[in-house]
Amino acid sequence: DNKGYCAQYRGEVCNAVLAKDALVFLNTSYADPEEAQELLVHTAWNELKVVSPVCRPAAEALLCNHIFQECSPGVVPTPIPICREYCLAVKELFCAKEWLVMEEKTHRGLYRSEMHLLSVPECSKLPSMHWDPTACARL
């Protein structure tokens, strides 16, 4: 599931969110990983047009870092997940109402885009920044 490679982000939609020249993980389960992941963001981005001004920037940051995860290069390139605390902040602080709607849409398969079911991250399954500060990405 986590087969892929590290590359500089060269897309458009997450330009304002991801660090300039960020190394991101591109998942080779897709035929064209850069395009596939960019398209997933686009699909979800359109949903974010209707969320509150408080939620939107937080949700965009979470979404971009969830789909274009930071990449740790090495013999086996590894995606670095978002830190649990940042995910929970978006879920419970900035986007509490919207999160419920997004979860509901996920369960009903409304985010299905061909082969990929775009789901909101499960915060509880993400590593905590208190366990190992290098094991997760901070937004």
């Epitope: 087969k3 060269r10 897309g11 458009e12 080779t28 389960s29 897709y30 035929a31 064209d32 990983p33 850069e34 395009e35 596939a36 960019e38 398209l39 686009h42 699909t43 885009s113 061909e114 082969m115 990929h116």
Partner: antibody, heavy 119, light 112 residues
Framework: EVQLVESGGGLVQPGGSLRLSCAAS????????LNWVRQAPGKGLEWVSY????????DYADSVKGRFTISRDNAKNSLYLQMNSLRDEDTAVYYC????????????WGQGTLVTVSS | DIVMTQSPLSLPVTPGEPASISCRSS???????????LDWYLQKPGQSPQLLIY???NRASGVPDRFSGSGSGTDFTLKINRVEAEDVGVYYC?????????FGQGTKLEIK
């Protein structure tokens, strides 16, 4: 609804030039690789060229390398094929086709535009 | 380049009968991600090609379930379990693993 509409075909003399266009609508154009595929009269399908979304990577069939140039304008939702030094064997219907980034398949095709190279 | 070889090149079929087309590639189309990058297309008379099967065995949206794809590596098969008059046309396999993407010669299915 996804739509791809080719234009620019016509009759041209050997050695001449032609520029094909493909106008796209109904999908997030900038997130797809796009291809040109051609079909000579009564023959099979031959892939010609592709261009990636925003990364600028592209490739050509050996038969057109150095003569054809693929390009795109994401702001205009348009794909182009500049064809120079045309030969008789370039006579074909040229299709533009969208490649699914998830599966790699050419999941939508235009209706095609006929290019005839003849003196 | 990967060479795609289809057989038969002509396939006369009686309506209601099954049909089968074979496609062989000169090298494996199985990617390290577990997918076979092999598609099947149908070009009906006077029309553009349309996608039937992707990744070897997945039916494209709107394709009737009488069509099925199977195979892995270098050997693939398209089956139509009960041919209908509207299925006439030329069937092509295509490898989408690497450029240049290459097509089989095509199989012309006609009604007997």
């Amino acid at each position: 609804e996804v739509q791809l509409v080719e234009s620019g075909g016509g009759l041209v003399q050997p050695g001449g030039s032609l520029r094909l266009s493909c106008a796209a609508s109904g999908f997030t154009f900038s997130s797809y690789r796009l291809n040109w595929v051609r079909q000579a009269p009564g023959k099979g399908l031959e892939w010609v060229s592709y261009i990636s979304s925003s990364t600028g990577s592209l490739d050509y069939a050996d038969s057109v390398k150095g003569r054809f140039t693929i390009s795109r304008d994401n702001a205009k939702n348009s794909l182009y094929l500049q064809m120079n030094s045309l030969r008789d064997e370039d006579t074909a219907v040229y299709y533009c086709a969208r490649r699914s980034p998830y599966t790699g398949s050419l999941d939508n095709w235009g209706q095609g535009t006929l290019v005839t190279v003849s003196s | 380049d990967i060479v795609m070889t289809q057989s038969p090149l002509s396939l006369p079929v009686t309506p209601g009968e099954p049909a089968s087309i074979s496609c062989r590639s000169s090298q494996s189309l199985l990617h390290s991600n577990g997918y076979n990058y092999l598609d099947w297309y149908l070009q009906k008379p006077g029309q553009s090609p349309q996608l039937l099967i992707y990744l070897g065995s997945n039916r494209a949206s709107g394709v009737p379930d009488r069509f099925s794809g199977s195979g892995s590596g270098t050997d693939f098969t398209l089956k139509i379990n009960r041919v209908e008059a509207e299925d006439v046309g030329v069937y092509y396999c295509m490898q989408a693993l690497q450029t240049p993407y290459t097509f089989g010669q095509g199989t012309k299915l006609e009604i007997k």
